[in-house]
Amino acid sequence: KEEQITFRDCADVFRSGLTTSGIYTLTFPNSTEETKAYCDMETGGGGWTTIQRREDGSVDFQRTWKEYKVGFGNPSGEHWLGNEFVSQLTNQQRYVLKIHLRDWEGNEAYSLYEHFYLSSEEFNYRIHLKGLTGTAGKISSISQPGNDFSTKDADNDKCICKCSQMLTGGWWFDACGPSNLNGMYYPQRQNTNKFNGIKWYYWKGSGYSLKATTMMIRPADF
C-alpha cells in the first residue's frame, strides 16, 4: 500500500513542490489527527501557515475555550486555526510569527517575532514571543512576558474584570492590554473610539478597530 504524504505545516507543503496559496490538510505532530489550514505561498518566500484571519466581520469570534482550542471559521476566510494544533506545532521546532495588519485608510503594517510558541493547554496556551521587528510599532502590542489565553468562559487574565467579556473574543489578555485581534469587527466609519474592537495599540492607538488582520507562522529555518 502506497504511503500517503503528510504535511506538518505549510512549509512542508511548499517544500513538497506545492507552491500555490490555498487550503491544505495538515497533520498534527506525532498523530494522525488532521486540520485544514490556509497556506500563504507568496508572502516573503511562502510557506506560511495562517493561524488567524479577520477581513469582513463574517465570523463571530466571541467563542468558547473549546472552540478556540479546536479552531473555527473557514481557512479561506475569517478563522482561528486552533490553539491545540498551534501549541503542538510550535513546540516541535522554532517558529516565527508574522502579524499583518490593515487599517481603513489603506495603510498596511506588520509585526514579526523571531521566536513564537504556545504552552500546552495545561498552561492555558500561554504565548511566548521573542525578537520583535516590523512596522506596526517598536513595542510589542502583545504584552510581554506573554499571558495565558482567555475566552468568555475561561478567565485567565490579570484584570479584576473579565477582559474577554468586556472586550470580546479570545486573546492573551493582560489587564486587558495593548491588543486584541479577535475583538468585535466594526465597519468603516464606525471603527474609531471602539475599545472592544480589533486593536493593535502600538500601531493605531486605543480606540481604533482595524479592517483586516492575518497571523501566520513559519519555521525559523525555512
Epitope: C159, C161, K162, M166, C176, N193, F195
Partner: antibody, heavy 121, light 107 residues
C-alpha cells in the same frame, strides 16, 4: 504624589474660544490616558473626550465633535482642552482626570481641581 | 449612549445610618462601573471601580456590588465626612456616561 493642576478661571464672551491646561506631576505622563469632564452649575458630570499622550490619539464625545480639541505637550507633561464657539450653556467647571490605563479609557483615579469657565455677554 | 439612572436623587440620613444608592444601566455594562464622591467646590474622588473594588485609602464602610445592569453603592455606617454627592459611571461602552448623582444630606 500624583497631581493634576489646572489653569485658573476664565470669563468668555459667546462665540469665543477657551483653552484650559492641566499639568501632571508625580507619574509618567505618557503612561495614562487623560480625559476631560465638565460639570454645569448644579448639574452632573459629562464626559467630553480623551487624549492618549503617548501617541496623541484622541476620542471625543459626539456632542462636542468639531468644537473641541485636546492636545498634550509631553515635554511639560501638560494636557490642553480647547473649546470653540462658546455658548452660555458651556458655562461649567471643566476637569481633567487621569484614566487608570494607557490602553483603554476605564475609570478616572486622579482629578484636577477644576477650572470654572463662564460664558457671558 | 448608555443611560445610567441613579436613585434616589437625594437622601436624608443621620450619622451611623446605613445608606444604599442604586444605579441602573440602560444596557449590560458587565462590571464596568465606578463610583465617585464629590463634595461642594471639589473635584470628584474615586471610591469604587469594577463595581466592587475599593480604591486605595477608601474606608471599608464603602462597598459596591452588582453586575449587568443593576449596581449598588452602600455606606454601612454614615460618618460626618460622608455627606456629599455620589455619582456612578459606566465605562463599558463609548462614550462613558455618569448617573445624575445622589446627594446624601444630614437629616
Amino acid at each position: 504624589q500624583v497631581q493634576l493642576v489646572q489653569s485658573g478661571a476664565e470669563v468668555k464672551k459667546p462665540g469665543a474660544s477657551v483653552k484650559v491646561s492641566c499639568k501632571a506631576s508625580g507619574y509618567s505622563f505618557t503612561d495614562y490616558n487623560m480625559v476631560w469632564v465638565r460639570q454645569a452649575p448644579g448639574q452632573g458630570l459629562e464626559w467630553m473626550g480623551y487624549i492618549d499622550p503617548y501617541n496623541g490619539g484622541t476620542g471625543y464625545n459626539q456632542k462636542f465633535e468639531g468644537r473641541v480639541t485636546m492636545t498634550t505637550d509631553t515635554s511639560t507633561s501638560t494636557a490642553y482642552m480647547e473649546l470653540r464657539s462658546l455658548r452660555s450653556d458651556d458655562t461649567a467647571v471643566y476637569y481633567c482626570a487621569r484614566t487608570r490605563d494607557r490602553y483603554d479609557v476605564w475609570y478616572f483615579d486622579v482629578w484636577g481641581q477644576g477650572t470654572l469657565v463662564t460664558v457671558s455677554s | 449612549d448608555i443611560q445610567m439612572t441613579q436613585s434616589p436623587s437625594s437622601v436624608s440620613a443621620s450619622v451611623g445610618d446605613r445608606v444604599t444608592i442604586t444605579c441602573k444601566a440602560s444596557q449590560d455594562v458587565y462590571i464596568a462601573v465606578a463610583w465617585y464622591q464629590q463634595k461642594p467646590g471639589k473635584a470628584p474622588k474615586l471610591l469604587i471601580y469594577w463595581a466592587s473594588t475599593r480604591d486605595t485609602g477608601v474606608p471599608s464602610r464603602f462597598s459596591g456590588s452588582g453586575s449587568g445592569t443593576d449596581f449598588t453603592l452602600t455606606i454601612s455606617s454614615l460618618q460626618p465626612e460622608d455627606f456629599a454627592t455620589y455619582y456612578c459611571h459606566q465605562y463599558s461602552s463609548y462614550p462613558p456616561t455618569f448617573g445624575g448623582g445622589t446627594k446624601v444630606e444630614i437629616k
